[in-house]
């Protein structure tokens, strides 16, 4: 698992609508993998970090001035839909293919 | 300041180009804003925030389970440029007004 | 409350073509697809086919390809199916049901019998 | 076409026991963590009524009596207790795929 040491990477995040109390509204499915950004983003920042100027600025930045400055954050820079059975005001079972913004696709560093 | 304790927020970072060694190709400015994102994610997420549905998912699981998963990160949403001159290949000072994403303009958590 | 009205029964002469309406209310009808079920007496339940009312597109099953049509009228919130060149095979109940894009059948009509004899 | 089959055709069960009904379909019903599956209540003259969709969640104003279960190709129905009103006929249905499809049918009669 990516711990504090480990570099910035994407890793498993089963998350339960039950635990969340998003199941009074979505009915299906039960859990879903949202997965999670786990990890440092340490000097150098490598390329699969897709680090921006900024970040990069902020790493050097940091380098130099520990306690002053903060390190990038690794954080979902780009997301994936799920699909969730949900009900309507109507109280009709309705499909949603594409709930956006659900799971991480990407991590990086911000 | 923010703090650990504070709200994530935009905050001030003066950056010197001497500090993190780019001052050998920039010639100016000596030194800019880059602005740093500092501060906390925590619950409820508030709108200014603009939370990615993840983002709110994750903050409502480390609630569950805080040792288990962090909290969303506090990190630049939107960046600007700077203009900046600098030293080309052949050392002809050459002004680049646009210097993409060296400066934050929104924070959120991510 | 949501109501899907249809007629009691029709009769039809062999060969002859019915067409069956179901009028819906108490929610907006182009919201939901509008699906038709055939039921012979005392056997099972057949999908027929299924219709958006919001732009008229339409799923069949294949067996009822060329026995049914499926159409709505918006401004009066009805749905019909029209069914052609009847034998003693299409004696049967026939509903129309309303549900999501997820395909469960939440409201029904009563039904209507269509009786084929000479 | 996803078939349906269902068992038992029928079955008698007493008052106040549970009444299970099984359901297998040819391929598995789920999708996107989501099992579609249904299922419906018929009595003599009257449409089916909505009973369970999802597999296991109760549509609106059926009692708790009623229970669904199951996932991929198989699938039951539980009625526990069992109420002299639950007599009637009980159809598992597939949303997965068009054409939808129906199984068989169980006939339930109280002893």
């Known amino acids: 698992s990516a711990g504090a040491g480990s570099h910035c990477q994407k890793t498993s995040l089963r998350v339960n609508f039950e635990d969340i109390g998003w199941d009074s509204w979505i009915i299906a499915p039960k859990e879903y993998e949202a997965y999670e950004c786990k990890g440092g983003c340490f000097f150098p920042l490598a390329d699969d970090v897709t680090p921006t100027k900024h970040a990069i600025v902020q790493t050097l930045v940091h380098l130099k001035f520990p306690t002053k400055v903060g390190k990038a954050c690794c954080v979902p820079t780009k997301l994936s839909p799920i699909s969730v059975l949900y009900k309507d005001d109507m109280g009709v079972p309705t499909l949603k293919y594409h709930y956006e913004g659900m799971s991480v696709a990407e991590c990086g560093c911000r | 300041s923010a703090g650990a304790g504070s709200h994530c927020q935009k905050t001030s970072l003066r950056v010197n180009f001497e500090d993190i060694g780019w001052d050998s190709w920039i010639i100016a400015p000596k030194e800019y804003e880059a602005y740093e994102c500092k501060g906390g994610c925590f619950f409820p997420l508030a709108d200014d925030v603009t939370p990615t549905k993840h983002a709110i998912v994750q903050t409502l699981v480390h609630l569950k389970f805080p040792t288990k998963v962090g909290k969303a990160c506090c990190v630049p949403t939107k960046l600007s440029p700077i203009s900046v001159l600098y030293k080309d290949d052949m050392g002809v000072p050459t002004l680049k007004y646009h210097y993409e994403g060296m400066s934050v303009a929104e924070c959120g958590c991510r | 409350q949501v109501q899907l009205q249809q007629p009691g029964a029709e009769a039809v002469k062999p060969g002859a073509s019915v067409k069956l309406s179901c009028k819906a209310s108490?929610?907006?009808?182009?919201?939901?697809?509008m699906h038709w079920v055939k039921q012979r007496p005392g056997q099972g339940l057949e999908w027929i086919g299924e219709?958006?009312?919001?732009?008229?597109?339409?799923n069949y099953n294949e067996k009822f390809k060329s026995k049914a049509t499926l159409t709505v009228d918006k401004s009066s919130s009805t749905a019909y199916m029209q069914l052609s060149s009847l034998t003693s095979e299409d004696f049967a109940v026939y509903y129309c049901?309303?549900?999501?894009?997820?395909?469960?059948?939440?409201?029904w009509g009563q039904g209507t019998l269509v009786t084929v004899s000479a | 076409d996803i078939v349906l089959t269902q068992s038992p055709a029928s079955l008698a069960v007493s008052l106040g026991q549970r009444a299970t009904i099984s359901c297998r379909a040819s391929?598995?019903?789920?999708?996107?963590?989501?099992?579609?599956m249904n299922w419906f209540q018929q009595k003599p003259g009257q449409p089916p009524k909505f009973l369970i969709y999802?597999?296991?969640n109760q549509g609106s104003g059926v009692p708790a009596r009623f229970s669904g279960s199951g996932s991929g190709t198989d699938f039951s129905l539980n009625i526990h207790p069992l109420e002299e009103d639950d007599t009637a006929m009980y159809f598992c249905?597939?949303?997965?795929?068009?054409?939808?499809?129906f199984g068989g049918g169980t006939k339930l009669e109280i002893k």
């Open positions: 049901t309303m549900g999501s894009n997820y395909g469960g059948f939440v409201y």
């Open positions: 108490g929610y907006t009808f182009t919201r939901y697809w």
């Open positions: 391929e598995s019903l789920d999708n996107y963590g989501i099992s579609f």
């Open positions: 219709i958006n009312p919001s732009n008229g597109g339409t």
């Open positions: 249905q597939q949303s997965k795929e068009v054409p939808r499809t």
């Open positions: 999802a597999a296991s």
